[in-house]
Amino acid sequence: HKSSSQGQDRHMIRMRQLIDIVDQLKNYVNDLVPEFLPAPEDVETNCEWSAFSCFQKAQLKSANTGNNERIINVSIKKLKRKPPSTNAGRRQKHRLTCPSCDSYEKKPPKEFLERFKSLLQKMIHQHLSSRTHGSEDS
């Protein structure tokens, strides 16, 4: 049980780090390629991990101009790092009924990042709720 809860804590830390990274990237929206990217919103229950992977797969790109290029690309690289797995995450990977990434509305980088942050906050909230109710699912 201890190692399981440590894994859950690691997962929480990682999700909060991702929020920090999204906030960091929001400072540089003018240095991002103004491409429209699939941005899940109002994600249905049990499709959070599927939507999360859509955000990670999106081709968020630095415009490669100016002194912020390296910072932006390091942050994008961090966003794509896989978080520690959870029981819920493992289960959801087997769901075939979640919308495909292409089916989500496409948004410019600013809204894309805002929606990513919103999903991360929802996942953290769910994670905390499930722990409060004694479950290991998140």
């Epitope: 960091q24 400072n27 002194n67 912020n68 290029e69 390296r70 910072i71 690309n73 390091v74 690289k77 961090k78 794509k80």
Partner: antibody, heavy 119, light 111 residues
Framework: EVQLVESGGGLVQPGGSLRLSCAAS????????MDWVRQAPGKGLEWVAE??????????YYAESVKGRFTISRDDSKNSVYLQMNSLKTEDTAVYYC??????????WGQGTLVTVSS | DIVMTQTPLSLSVTPGQPASISCRAS??????????MHWYLQKPGQPPQLLIY???NLESGVPDRFSGSGSGTDFTLKISRVEAEDVGVYYC?????????FGQGTKLEIK
């Protein structure tokens, strides 16, 4: 355990060429940003070149002192990064370290390979 | 290019005593609350090892007697109680932009 092993160093005359190799293991190489950093005998550290990951389309970057003479490349299928050094100068004499830039800072370093440019 | 200047270039410390190394960047390496400054130790005959990243974060496995602070252009590496194994050359390095540059190094020896 992460390992970076450099090879290909040696003695070369000014104007000559040398190709350094770095074999990597213990991490997902294709995702890694790889760099070469050098250290002249008794001197400090100098960044030389960087090649980013496939996800970034493998862009390359160079220090002004080596631009046009050195070429960094990688082969993700062999978990290897290379430094082709042409038109070598005596001031290129140094230990060349292969390093992985992991998010913030050079976390993993090889033991280095010595390049001596002398007539 | 951002020039990194370290002081002192050498210091001799009695075991158990504190030590402090400063690094000044020729322009700010901080932005939006992040400071892109890192510290390394190169022990004799070895490659450098990362000690501190992003100005104040201790790299995994590094003893907590090491600490980093600072923002903007001025940064400090502190060792609360120097041990014999801390001898070597300490380097600061920025990653604010390319080219990445290092300080000239500070040699620490034991008295």
């Amino acid at each position: 355990e992460v390992q970076l092993v450099e090879s290909g160093g040696g003695l070369v005359q000014p104007g000559g060429s040398l190709r350094l190799s770095c074999a990597a293991s213990g991490f997902t190489f294709s995702d890694a940003w790889m760099d070469w950093v050098r250290q002249a005998p008794g001197k400090g550290l100098e960044w030389v070149a960087e090649i980013r990951s496939e996800a970034d389309n493998h862009p390359t970057y160079y220090a002004e002192s080596v631009k046009g003479r050195f070429t960094i490349s990688r082969d993700d299928s062999k978990n290897s990064v290379y430094l082709q050094m042409n038109s070598l100068k005596t001031e290129d004499t140094a230990v060349y370290y292969c390093t992985e830039y992991d998010y913030e800072g050079f976390v993993h370093w090889g033991q280095g390979t010595l390049v001596t440019v002398s007539s | 290019d951002i020039v990194m200047t370290q002081t002192p270039l050498s210091l001799s410390v009695t075991p158990g005593q504190p030590a402090s190394i400063s690094c000044r960047a020729s322009k700010s390496v901080s932005t939006y609350g992040y400071s892109y400054m890192h510290w390394y130790l190169q022990k004799p005959g070895q490659p450098p090892q990362l000690l501190i990243y992003l100005a104040s974060n201790l790299e995994s496995g590094v003893p907590d007697r090491f600490s980093g602070s600072g923002s903007g252009t001025d940064f400090t590496l502190k060792i609360s109680r120097v041990e014999a194994e801390d001898v070597g050359v300490y380097y600061c390095q920025h990653s604010r932009e390319l080219p990445l540059t290092f300080g000239q190094g500070t040699k620490l020896e034991i008295k």
